[in-house]
């Protein structure tokens, strides 16, 4: 299994981040990261923008090895982790993802990857074995993306230009690549 | 869609110089390892190499060293493979294919995408 | 290099039934993947990662195995599963697969 500790640059540890360049359609229920509290858009914080570029949302930096069975690799690597809701630049708070800025059948901006970048990695295995080098592609940039609550979630599913995503198999985790189990995981994902 | 597109069919004599090619479409090749497969008449696939299009790194399999060469322009996202001089036994499909990246808390790596195929005849 | 062997090279069955497929690695792999290929067609990703199910893939096919014994299950043939299945190794180099099982109908 994987190394799944992750480290931000404030040294907070947090288990099992889920992946970014190519999600699940299903997002496990024990798994959630810096998730928005529920609750309606404050009424002081009034926002009838349509400029998505007036808003922001958190870029976290996280450092992790990269794992292939035994082996890992010689050094981490570290990428971007997408946080909470997006709101505008002005009106975002310290604290992640504390606000849901969306009206209930208004407008949703999610914060989700934008860029990635690729990196070759090469791993380390006990007992001496030589692996092979291996490809990751990490996160470099999140963007705000405009949605509304009655948009289709696959949206929410295409956060890199792969559409060739595996689906996740049948572990004590919840099956299946067809829709990634319950939504509300996947709304408060990023 | 995320697809790679392989170059058409091919005949040649023995002798002959050839090389095949493979783009990639809706994604970059540089950011993966691009593989080569032969696959020979009614029989099973064969690993041939590897190359990362960053840089232009390869690796071979020790059948294939020195009889065919990988080589790629991330500019066009495009793969390729030749050979200086093909022989009978080259007769085969050849298949190249993406190693396609996926992390939840644990890296996975598989072929995921792969080229329709690109059929080589050499025969004089 | 790390030789992987199919058993059985063959294996006639009718729709319906279940299918077992062998892959045994010549040394300790900690992965194994597989693919089904049809005639005239690329091989296509089936379970990788062992166990874990390629996007659209239905939920008859199943991956187990670990160390140097690796099995693919399909519960109950349907009549397009009739194919090659070939498993493959990519943690070490030179990558290689399996010589195949051809999974026909009795």
């Known amino acids: 299994q994987g190394w799944q500790a992750f480290k931000n640059d404030a040294t907070e540890i947090i288990p099992g981040l889920r992946e970014y360049p190519e999600p699940p359609q299903e997002l496990e229920n024990n798994q959630t990261m810096n998730r928005a509290e529920n609750g309606g858009r404050p009424p002081h914080h009034p926002y009838d923008t349509k400029d998505v570029s007036e808003y922001s949302c958190r870029e976290l930096h996280y450092t992790r090895f990269v794992t292939d069975g035994p082996c890992r690799s010689a050094k981490p690597v570290t990428e971007l982790v997408c946080s909470g809701q997006c709101g505008p630049a002005r009106l975002l708070p310290n604290a992640i993802g504390r606000v849901k800025w969306w009206r209930p059948n208004g407008p949703d901006f999610r914060c989700i990857p934008d860029r990635y970048r690729a990196q070759r990695v090469q791993l380390l295995c006990p007992g001496g074995a030589a692996p092979r080098s291996r490809k990751v592609r990490l996160v470099a940039s999140c963007k705000c993306k405009r949605l509304t609550r009655f948009h289709n979630q696959s949206e929410l599913k295409d956060f890199g230009p792969e559409t060739a995503r595996p689906q996740k198999g049948r572990k004590p985790r919840p099956r299946a690549r067809g829709a990634k189990a319950n939504q509300a995981e996947l709304e408060n994902a990023y | 869609e995320v697809q790679l597109v392989q170059s058409g069919a091919e005949v040649k004599k023995p002798g002959e110089s050839l090389k095949i090619s493979c783009k990639g479409s809706?994604?970059?090749?540089?950011?993966?390892?691009i593989h080569w497969v032969r696959q020979m008449p009614g029989k099973g696939l064969e690993w041939m190499g590897q190359i990362d299009a960053e840089d232009g790194e390869t690796e071979y399999a020790p059948r294939f060293q020195g009889q065919v060469t990988i080589s790629a322009d991330k500019s066009i996202s495009t793969a390729y493979l030749q050979w200086s001089s093909l022989k009978a036994s080259d007769t085969a499909m050849y298949y190249c294919?993406?190693?396609?990246?996926?992390?939840?808390?644990?890296?996975?790596?598989?072929?995921?995408?792969w080229g329709q195929g690109t059929t080589v005849t050499v025969s004089s | 290099e790390i030789v992987l062997t199919q058993s059985p090279a063959t294996l006639s069955l009718s729709p319906g039934e279940r299918a077992t497929l062998s892959c045994s690695a010549s040394?300790?792999?900690?992965?194994i993947h597989w693919y089904q290929q049809k005639p005239g067609q690329a091989p296509r990703l089936l379970i990788y990662?062992?166990?874990e199910l390629a996007s659209g893939i239905p939920a008859r096919f199943s991956g187990s195995g670990s160390g140097t014994d690796f099995t693919l299950t399909i519960s109950s043939l349907e009549p397009e599963d009739f194919a090659v299945y070939y498993c493959?190794?990519?943690?070490?180099?030179?990558?290689?697969f399996g010589g195949g099982t051809k999974v026909e109908i009795k």
């Open positions: 294919a993406r190693e396609g990246y996926y992390y939840d808390g644990r890296d996975y790596w598989y072929f995921d995408v």
């Open positions: 040394s300790s792999v900690s992965y």
């Open positions: 990662s062992t166990s």
């Open positions: 809706d994604f970059e090749i540089k950011d993966y390892y």
């Open positions: 493959q190794q990519l943690s070490h180099l030179p990558l290689t």
